[in-house]
């Protein structure tokens, strides 16, 4: 058993049929010595008396808010949560496996630039009685500070019969140099509590590996005389690291109809303009990627050909 | 200890092309190592990230773009003195800081070159003959060093009398290649910045 936060404790249980469970001793936070009784949750049934209560925690029915009272007055609470371990593996029931970039990816993180700011998100089908708490650091043995905000519900989607909820959090490395060469990864730890179930999820990455620029901005078209060709120009996204001559991007320019199966024109360039062949009912799209370290491409920025 | 906006002569900054080739070569070599050594811990997640130039050179700091010198987090206290001549310095107006930066890059390349050559000598003794260093990568390091054209003491190639541990050597190769790729990215950024200045 360990303390998650004040008056909240996590009991780690090996989860299998007829498991013995864990013996837990609760102590009432009071100078009082006698006349103390214990109850669980909203029940008025007295579980025991005395300053300490010893319980055998085996299942979720044994978890919950234990309260010690004296003469009708509440003295203190202890909330017990369960963390299940099945076949030596901690449970991952609360969050959905996003399977990208690989299986068992519960947390996904992205950074728009090298400033040390990044966003992580996760998915769940659970809608109520759910709380998250996020901590982060650079490195684990001698951790350097990363400050994370509160996790918030950022999107709701319908997937078949299920509703899916996306939560996200923004974090900022306390003293980040955009030009630095990372040798210690960022560690992100998410504590998830659903009702009386506790789970924790972690992700470890270098900012350079989670870079995904914003789409290029200000796409403009200029038809070329006596030609099917169009000159398309754009600018670096505002959120990208500066100076741009140091943090350079490369671009992919594509002309395509509405269907992915349609024919297309595609060209790659390090410049902020390109010449492509425009077709009726097609769109010109441009996306960006770090020129020197191939992490993710940005989303497409698009304009219609006409 | 940063790069002011220098004004090299018109035309291609001589080292940009070489630095692009360097990044390509080390990326290809790293990809080859990952594929060939698939049963060794050779991915970014699996290896320890070590920098053999740590406390010996200060390329990131010496080559910091002017725009980042206002960022306190970028101003490391490490100071290193370097020799200040070099053929990539295409203009007389080139500052002392730029010379410091380029000479730090040269020292990086020299250290990696020695490490890679020592390692290759060991890998050539491996009866499995599983992996060797790409001669193209070694040639590209050499070309960039020549383009930088700094005079400095030659570092003797390390020779080891004991029987090499090929497993450890291959893991060290992965560690070196990952670190060198990151440094090659920095070098490419620096050359691109200087070329644009």
């Amino acid at each position: 058993i360990w303390e998650l936060k004040k008056d909240v404790y996590v009991v780690e249980l090996d989860w299998y049929p007829d498991a013995p469970g864990e013996m837990v001793v609760l102590t009432c936070d009071t100078p009082e010595e006698d006349g103390i009784t214990w109850t669980l949750d909203q029940s008025s049934e007295v579980l025991g008396s005395g300053k300490t209560l010893t319980i055998q925690v085996k299942e979720f029915g044994d978890a919950g808010q234990y309260t010690c009272h004296k003469g009708g007055e509440v003295l203190s609470h202890s909330l017990l949560l369960l963390h299940k371990k099945e076949d030596g593996i901690w449970s991952t029931d609360i969050l959905k496996d996003q399977k990208e970039p690989k299986n068992k990816t519960f947390l996904r993180c992205e950074a728009k630039n090298y400033s040390g700011r990044f966003t992580c998100w996760w998915l769940t089908t659970i809608s109520t009685d759910l709380t998250f708490s996020v901590k982060s650091s650079r490195g684990s043995s001698d951790p350097q500070g990363v400050t994370c905000g509160a996790a918030t519900l950022s999107a709701e989607r319908v997937r078949g019969d299920n509703k899916e909820y996306e939560y996200s959090v923004e974090c900022q490395e306390d003293s980040a140099c955009p030009a630095a060469e990372e040798s210690l990864p960022i560690e992100v730890m998410v504590d998830a509590v659903h009702k009386l179930k506790y789970e924790n999820y972690t992700s470890s990455f270098f900012i350079r590996d989670i870079i995904k620029p914003d789409p290029p901005k200000n796409l403009q078209l200029k038809p070329l005389k006596n030609s099917r060709q169009v000159e398309v120009s754009w600018e670096y996204p505002d959120t990208w690291s500066t100076p741009h001559s140091y943090f350079s991007l490369t671009f992919c320019v594509q002309v395509q109809g509405k269907s992915k199966r349609e024919k297309k024109d595609r060209v790659f360039t390090d410049k902020t303009s390109a010449t492509v062949i425009c077709r009726k009912n097609a769109s010109i799209s441009v996306r960006a990627q770090d020129r020197y370290y191939s992490s993710s491409w940005s989303e497409w920025a698009s304009v219609p050909c006409s | 200890r940063n790069l002011p906006v220098a004004t090299p002569d018109p035309g291609m900054f001589p080292c940009l092309h070489h630095s692009q080739n360097l990044l390509r070569a080390v990326s290809n070599m790293l990809q080859k190592a990952r594929q060939t050594l698939e049963f060794y811990p050779c991915t970014s997640e699996e290896i320890d990230h070590e920098d053999i130039t740590k406390d010996k050179t200060s390329t990131v700091e010496a080559c910091l773009p002017l725009e980042l010198t206002k960022n306190e987090s970028c101003l490391n206290s490490r100071e290193t003195s370097f020799i200040t001549n070099g053929s990539c310095l295409a203009s007389r107006k080139t500052s002392f800081m730029m010379a410091l930066c380029l000479s730090s890059i040269y020292e990086d390349l020299k250290m990696y070159q020695v490490e890679f050559k020592t390692m290759n000598a060991k890998l050539l003794m491996d009866p499995k003959r599983q992996i060797f260093l790409d001669q193209n990568m070694l040639a590209v390091i050499d070309e960039l060093m020549q383009a930088l054209n700094f005079n400095s003491e030659t570092v003797p190639q390390k020779s080891s009398l004991e029987e090499p541990d090929f497993y450890k050597t291959k893991i060290k190769l992965c560690i070196l290649l990952h670190a060198f790729r990151i440094r090659a990215v920095t070098i490419d950024r620096v050359m691109s910045y200087l070329n644009a200045s």
Partner: antibody, heavy 118, light 107 residues
Framework: QVQLVQSGAEVKKPGSSVKVSCKAS????????LHWVRQAPGQQLEWMGW????????EYAPKFQGRVTITADESTSTAYMELSSLRSEDTAVYYC???????????WGQGTLVTVSS | DIVMTQSPLSLPVTPGEPASISCRAS??????LHWYQQKPGQAPRLLIY???QSISGVPSRFSGSGSGTDFTLTISSLQPEDFATYYC?????????FGQGTKVEIK
Amino acid sequence: QVQLVQSGAEVKKPGSSVKVSCKASGGTFSDYYLHWVRQAPGQQLEWMGWIDPENGDTEYAPKFQGRVTITADESTSTAYMELSSLRSEDTAVYYCARNKELRYFDVWGQGTLVTVSS
Amino acid sequence: DIVMTQSPLSLPVTPGEPASISCRASQSISINLHWYQQKPGQAPRLLIYFASQSISGVPSRFSGSGSGTDFTLTISSLQPEDFATYYCQQSNSFPLTFGQGTKVEIK
């Protein structure tokens, strides 16, 4: 299986014209760009131009502009390349090639040898 | 027009040995570079597109690398069927242009 089948070899006199055909099978004809590329004996490949069979849009290499005409007949899934004012240096194997991507070629015809000789 | 220069023009190789063919563009073309193989009396065949992207059905011993002006086609271990002429082609701008070709011959 996508295939491009070209018309047979031709012998032409200088100053005349030649029209080579390229019939496509497999896949929808208008879903692909169609190009013509030639190769003189022992020489490198030389791109001549492309057509979008969907709308008849064409683009030609400046070297052949005014001398080459590329057309397409959607009803027969056939593209044509006509080269006029032939000279001896136009002796070459003419290939049609196609792709959903405009700028490179993933399926090629077998080639048509055009010999220009007096 | 962008001029593509291949080297060497002729490359004698022992079967089983690796081979590398270089292609240089007269100006930067990013990764807009494609490789083809041509055997005598046959049409070219696409091997690699956009500098390094492999084509399904093409053996994995063929790989491409490069960007900007310098590109390389590598055959990791030459098989008897690989003796042919190889062409690079740029698609950065029209007109599309090819290299002169590199003939890989049996040593």
